[in-house]
Amino acid sequence: VPLDPISVSNSSSQIILKWKPPSDPNGNITHYLVFWERQAEDSELFELDYCLKGLKLPSRTWSPPFESEDSQKHNQSEYEDSAGECCSCPKTDSQILKELEESSFRKTFEDYLHNVVFVPRKTSSGTGAEDPRPSRKRRSLGDVGNVTVAVPTVAAFPNTSSTSVPTSPEEHRPFEKVVNKESLVISGLRHFTGYRIELQACNQDTPEERCSVAAYVSARTMPEAKADDIVGPVTHEIFENNVVHLMWQEPKEPNGLIVLYEVSYRRYGDEELHLCVSRKHFALERGCRLRGLSPGNYSVRIRATSLAGNGSWTEPTYFYVTDYLDVPSNIAK
């Protein structure tokens, strides 16, 4: 098994993967296979109303760059506390013995996996023991720039009438064959998106591939600047009883997903008022409605909040609310 895989993101579209060779390989390592697949965001994020008081916005951090070549920074869960920076204590004799035993066990276990669990992969020639798994299309390193990632479909609202279950068939997973090195730059990824990366060490090339059990690591690409900005105008419609319907377009490719919108509005001469618009609210109304507004000139600004944080405020939109008691009752509704 490849050891200590570390994944970091250095841009909104790339993840750098580094690892160490197996400590006791079965024969010579000829190459490594790296598979990756996009992870669907937790369905809870689609369901929860992050405008509710006391409900903290989900913290989603991307995988930060390496501190040093040798540092083993495991990708920390956003829900875990980071440990203080400490030096490791000197190992005791019993620890050293234990590690030697574990190393010996790992070697024996890998041999067992190779000989008993993993049947050598044969090319589908119609005879012999065929690989039960689907054959994976190879991409050469030259194709790294235009990776096409199989994107799992996530229902925008899991508690609606139909929920789609994210599936990512193995045959659609992009992968890379890495020869003579213990690192890979995976490119062409979606911004601020979690990826599950699978790494295997192989000691025989085609036609029969003998590969280790997989080591797994997760990483999230960095956010894309301006991806959470609301593009296009904020439009409005004024209805009877001084109800104003504000409408805007959802950012097309947000960082992760938009969890809420902040609407900030004020009447000329008054203090600013705020409205929080949840995903569900926006989906139902294509925006939001302001009701019970006093007559006067108003300005309104809107910004989206995604898993990566806040987008920019829109340019102010202005509207005028008349005293509806003086307006004929056939006003557009």
Epitope: D49, L52, H274, C276, K280, A283, E285, R286
Partner: antibody, heavy 118, light 112 residues
Framework: EVQLVETGGGVVQPGRSLRLSCAAS????????MHWVRQAPGKGLEWVAV????????YYADSVKGRFTISRDNSKNTLYLQMNSLRAEDTAVYYC????WGFGFDYWGQGTTVTVSS | DVVMTQSPLSLPVTLGQPASISCRSS???????????LNWFQQRPGQSPRRLIY???KRDSGVPDRFSGSGSGTDFTLKISRVEAEDVGVYYC?????????FGGGTKLEIK
Amino acid sequence: EVQLVETGGGVVQPGRSLRLSCAASGFTFSSYAMHWVRQAPGKGLEWVAVISYSGSNKYYADSVKGRFTISRDNSKNTLYLQMNSLRAEDTAVYYCARHEWGFGFDYWGQGTTVTVSS
Amino acid sequence: DVVMTQSPLSLPVTLGQPASISCRSSQSLVYGDGNTYLNWFQQRPGQSPRRLIYKVSKRDSGVPDRFSGSGSGTDFTLKISRVEAEDVGVYYCMQGTYWPMTFGGGTKLEIK
């Protein structure tokens, strides 16, 4: 003037189906999310389902999930409720209502009565 | 779901006298933006419901000023300063802060 008129109610046996309609007029129907709310005889109000302005998002009360389907035809300014596998406890007056987030419902129809009985 | 509890169940009132209906929610109805989405509906006999009050205290257009709403957090009140014959019916509180929106059980206002 905003008007909502429900039709399609009636007496039906348990396990059978019924489709309710709600004709809307006097406002831009396609700009509003719409709800169905019901009221069992002598009882209080119970929210049933909502559909977004475009029809792409739908939500249901747990009591009807999997049995009832809300839909709309914006070209006809009409809201629908398809009720399958009806039970005695679905007996109620069914109202369609216009949605206002947080503020509940600003306009209601007159209601249509559904009786589920063998 | 958020439970809305109304009291009393029945409220006999003399014409011209004040009336007060209480509504209590199982959770605070203050939304993250500071708004409180508590609404009051009136249902006259044989009619469909009609909204009287939204956001705790704001009267809908056409609602007489004898109706007023107050409260905060989890405790809310609808007051009628002088009851008139046309006020007879059932009054419901409804919260719109949490999904799904839920109604109180109703308070039946009748004339003594």
